[in-house]
């Protein structure tokens, strides 16, 4: 037996740096969707009521506690009748997989904020991206959320050579040794060591000395 007409399927969490959207299929015809997400009291909260979209932004809910394991479901109603039910007296619905933001949100592509050379040392700073996770009415950065559980790996190489080197930090700054008079290029990657999946981000865009972001001091 296939999926009944109107019932959602392929429910998928799409989440990067805690910005979290639930997606599903199919595109509706003559019916609408309503999403419910279970809160920490295991109550179902309504979101995206009566939508004809196949996605629902649940960021506002999951950022309340990023360590909580959430479950959502997509309810299907015939168009114009939010009270319509299936044969069992309930609307057709499909459950999502469980989702724990802290463990599962993808790490977004990091950005090198700046680099500064002083003699034979270069300080490379990674932008501490703001997330939508709040504490005391302020938005937390990625570092605020993950603390020492977030590592950045730096790849760097002389512009004139292909041999790369690497360094790591559990802050957002690197201090590396360079050869005087040489230009270097840099790229960073974020890692959550404690994870077993979704551990690494994509590499940041490459930034090279002699371009805008750098500063040089003798």
């Amino acid at each position: 037996a296939g999926t009944p007409p109107g019932k959602a399927f392929n429910l998928t969490w799409i989440s990067t740096d805690f910005k979290t959207i639930l997606e599903w299929q199919p595109k509706p015809t003559n019916y609408t969707y309503t999403v419910q997400i279970s809160d920490r009291s295991r109550n179902w909260k309504y979101k995206c009521t009566g939508t004809t979209d196949t996605e629902c932004d649940l960021t506002d809910e999951i950022v309340k506690d990023v360590n909580w394991t959430y479950e959502a479901r997509v309810l299907s109603y015939p168009a114009g009748n939010v009270e319509s039910t299936g044969s069992a007296g309930e609307p057709l619905y499909e459950n999502s997989p469980e989702f724990t933001p802290y463990l599962e949100t993808n790490l977004g592509q990091p950005t090198i904020q700046s680099f500064e050379q002083v003699g034979t040392k270069v300080n490379v700073t990674v932008e501490d991206e703001r997330t939508l996770v709040r504490r005391n009415n302020t938005f937390l950065s990625l570092r605020d959320v993950f603390g020492k559980d977030l590592i950045y790996t730096l790849y760097y190489w002389k512009s004139s050579s292909s041999g790369k080197k690497t360094a790591k930090t559990n802050t957002n700054e690197f201090l590396i040794d360079v050869d005087k008079g040489e230009n270097y290029c840099f790229s960073v990657q974020a890692v959550i060591p404690s994870r077993t999946v979704n551990r690494k981000s994509t590499d940041s865009p490459v930034e090279c000395m002699g371009q805008e972001k750098g500063e040089f001091r003798e």
Partner: antibody, heavy 117, light 107 residues
């Protein structure tokens, strides 16, 4: 469970090449950094280099750069070490290891390589 | 490149003794230092990571301390099964470097 199994070692003549493999199971190599480390008979551990299998980034100890090449086949969940222009001093047990970014948490059993005429 | 100087290269101690091994880095390695135990014919086994953190399943008689360039590994009460060679590894920047190793024997 997580396992790393090296293969491809053996006896080879100086100047020849050898390709070692490290088959991973219980995890996807693309989620981790992967390393090769070697140990000559009666000597200490020596780091060769690493790869990020997801993007192909490789880093080597300069003494191995150009002569040794690390690669990965994500579809086969396997790491490789291509060793060219082998010398007697390359005789060692070669280990692959998984890196969680704070430590090497799993190692293979090692595969011995002997370079001799 | 960062050099790791490990000492002593060998030491002999009695069961129950407190044993200390040191590793000195040629520059600040910001606690990116691990300690491994290796027994003959076996792969290294992680004991301590990030200079001071005990790896899962490792007995509490093993400990690590230090920061900057100076690091210490301690076995508080030596057991017969601790006979092995011990290595430090810095992984703060490439090339990663191991100490020369300390061969531990029981008198």
């Amino acid at each position: 469970q997580v396992q790393l199994v090296e293969s491809g070692g053996g006896v080879v003549q100086p100047g020849r090449s050898l390709r070692l493999s490290c088959k991973a199971s219980g995890f996807n190599i693309k989620d981790y950094y992967m390393h090769w480390v070697r140990q000559a008979p009666g000597k200490g551990l020596e780091w060769i280099g690493l790869i990020d299998p997801e993007n192909g980034n490789t880093i080597y100890d300069p003494k191995f750069q150009g002569r040794f090449t690390i690669s990965a086949d994500n579809s086969k969940n396997t790491l490789f070490l291509q060793m060219d222009s082998l010398r007697p001093e390359d005789t060692a047990v070669y280990y692959c290891a998984r890196d969680n970014s704070y430590y090497f948490d799993y190692w293979g059993q090692g595969t011995p390589v002997t370079v001799s005429s | 490149d960062i050099q790791m100087t490990q000492s002593p290269s060998s030491l002999s101690a009695s069961v129950g003794d407190r044993v200390t091994i040191t590793c000195k880095a040629s520059q600040d390695i910001r606690k990116y230092l691990n300690w491994y135990q290796q027994k003959p014919g076996k792969a290294p086994k992680l004991l301590i990571y990030y200079a001071t953190s005990l790896a899962d399943g490792v007995p509490s008689r093993f400990s690590g301390s230090g920061s900057g360039t100076d690091y210490t590994f301690t076995i508080s009460s030596l057991q017969p099964e601790d006979i092995a060679t011990y290595y430090c590894l810095q992984h703060g920047e490439s090339p990663y470097t191991f100490g020369q190793g300390t061969k531990l024997e029981i008198t």
